[in-house]
């Protein structure tokens, strides 16, 4: 299980059922829970413990959160007590009020999204409820909208990215990991299009290229082949030098 | 306990501006959404709309949008109503509401201001 | 927007007598996560409002169980068993699902 660095889970035996303050266990107790042990709590218990862990900083697995989540099915009003990541395993419909969800999904922009991957539910049910909640209808988005999504601009389909790629593919810049097919095919259309903020390839600069550099490898040959073709060496002489770039396809 | 405290009475002239403050205590401010309830004299009650304290961003009903206005001081934990260039109409008192939202089944106005009598005379 | 009508307008009753008012909302409004916010208030003569029943059946803390909630669609009613001497004044109901909230025009709980 994952832990506070250098620190190791002690054994519990049970120290969770009944201990006088589930806040008085150290970070090293509190680390190694098992889910088998959360089971048996109640919900008070439980949310003692999920305080707890937030107070002393004591980091999860995902396994773990995703135990602690099951069993809080009321969680507390404030969300701030919690462990921040452990919001992404929560139900959003629990935080479906017009002033709950707002604060829940600005908790939500300061957790490792990408601790859930792309397909996983609990990741998959977050953008719709978190968009109906900052008011979205339809693909057009405004640049508050993308700020307060936070990592689940992310997971914008290709719709939001065609409606709304002045504000989007800023921000898709950045997001780790690939886009999937649906979002580099908008990506590379809205890039060839030439619209806001990045304009037309033919007259991008190595700076533009900077700028793109989490979406190079979406661009298609048509899009490489209209960019200054000194740029595009320019760039990729300098990127050489730092491998961490990802270079667009040749 | 918690409660809202409403500011005084208030009588003003056709044209003037009157701002009501509500203040909130015994529980998180920022928990909680603030609305705005009109009861004109011998009247029901008419939701004006509301603030998210947490954002700040207010939502007017239809009938209170441009020459009403709902504001917060954080920091004081305290909802403010501002009417510009009041009417005959406006006489009434407002009530300051705290708008529960918690989980999906405990939404309600469950924490109420004495209310603000404002009269408008020339 | 959601409009609320309350029936009657004045409800004249006898102390320890059964009272039924209804409140019928001109489109239903259920919130996307599935449930009805429909409440009931009580506003006695000179005070501010209080909370009487919530999510159309649900009774708040210290509301006395002869307060009962019933209700779905556009068709929601609140009744009294018995009513007391305390009971007496303005009910209403307001939907709490979509903005802008609505009240119903209110129904005025008297003494026959």
């Known amino acids: 299980l994952a832990g506070e660095t250098g620190q190791e889970a002690a054994p519990l035996d049970g120290v969770l059922a009944n201990p006088p303050n589930i806040s008085s266990l150290s970070p090293r107790q509190l680390l190694g829970f098992p889910c088998a042990e959360v089971s048996g709590l109640s919900t008070e218990r439980v949310r003692e413990l999920a305080v707890a862990l937030a107070q002393k900083n004591v980091k999860l697995s995902t396994e773990q959160l995703r135990c602690l989540a099951h069993r809080l099915s009321e969680p507390p009003e404030d969300l701030d007590a919690l462990p921040l990541d452990l919001l992404l395993f929560l139900n959003p419909d629990a935080f479906s009020g017009p002033q709950a969800c707002t604060r829940f999904f600005s908790r939500i922009t300061k957790a490792n999204v990408d601790l859930l991957p792309r397909g996983a539910p609990e990741r998959q049910r977050l953008l719709p409820a978190a968009l109906a909640c900052w008011g979205v209808r339809g693909s057009l988005l405004s640049e508050a909208d993308v700020r307060a999504l936070g990592g689940l601009a992310c997971d914008l389909p290709g719709r939001f990215v065609a409606e709304s790629a002045e504000v989007l593919l800023p921000r898709l810049v950045s997001c780790p990991g690939p886009l999937d097919q649906d979002q580099q095919e908008a990506a590379r259309a809205a890039l060839q299009g030439g619209g806001p903020p990045y304009g037309p390839p033919s007259t991008w600069s190595v700076s533009t290229m900077d700028a793109l550099r989490g979406l190079l490898p979406v661009l298609g040959q048509p899009i490489i082949r209209s960019i200054p073709q000194g740029i595009v060496a320019a760039w990729r002489q300098r990127s050489s030098r730092d491998p961490s770039w990802r270079q667009p396809e040749r | 306990q918690i409660q809202l405290v409403q500011s005084g009475p208030e009588l003003k002239k056709p044209g003037e501006t009157v701002k009501i403050s509500c203040k909130a205590s015994?529980?998180?401010?920022?928990?909680?959404?603030m609305n705005w309830v009109k009861q004109a004299p011998g009247k029901g009650l008419k939701w004006m709309g509301w603030?998210?304290?947490?954002?700040?961003?207010?939502s007017y009903a239809d009938d209170f949008k441009g020459r009403f206005a709902f504001s917060l001081e954080t920091s004081a934990s305290t909802a403010y109503l501002q009417i510009n260039n009041l009417k005959n109409e406006d006489m009434a008192t407002y009530f300051c509401?705290?708008?529960?939202?918690?989980?999906?089944?405990?939404?309600?106005?469950?924490?109420w201001g004495a209310g603000t009598t404002v009269t408008v005379s020339s | 927007d959601v409009l609320m009508t309350q029936t009657p307008l004045s409800l004249p009753v006898s102390l320890g007598d059964q009272a039924s008012i209804s409140c019928r909302s001109s489109?239903?409004?259920?919130?996307?996560?599935?449930?009805?916010?429909l409440e009931w208030y009580l506003q006695k003569p000179g005070q501010s409002p209080k909370l009487l029943i919530y999510?159309?059946?649900n009774r708040f803390s210290g509301v006395p169980d002869r307060f009962s909630g019933s209700g779905s669609g556009t068709d929601f009613t609140l009744k009294i068993s018995r009513v007391e001497a305390e009971d007496l004044g303005f009910y209403y109901c307001?939907?709490?699902?979509?903005?802008?909230?609505?009240f119903g025009g209110g129904t005025k709980l008297e003494i026959k």
């Open positions: 015994g529980y998180t401010f920022t928990h909680y959404g």
């Open positions: 489109q239903s409004f259920v919130h996307s996560n599935g449930n009805t916010y």
């Open positions: 999510k159309v059946s």
């Open positions: 509401a705290r708008r529960r939202d918690y989980g999906t089944s405990h939404w309600y106005l469950d924490v």
């Open positions: 603030i998210n304290t947490y954002t700040g961003e207010p």
């Open positions: 307001f939907q709490g699902s979509h903005v802008p909230y609505t």
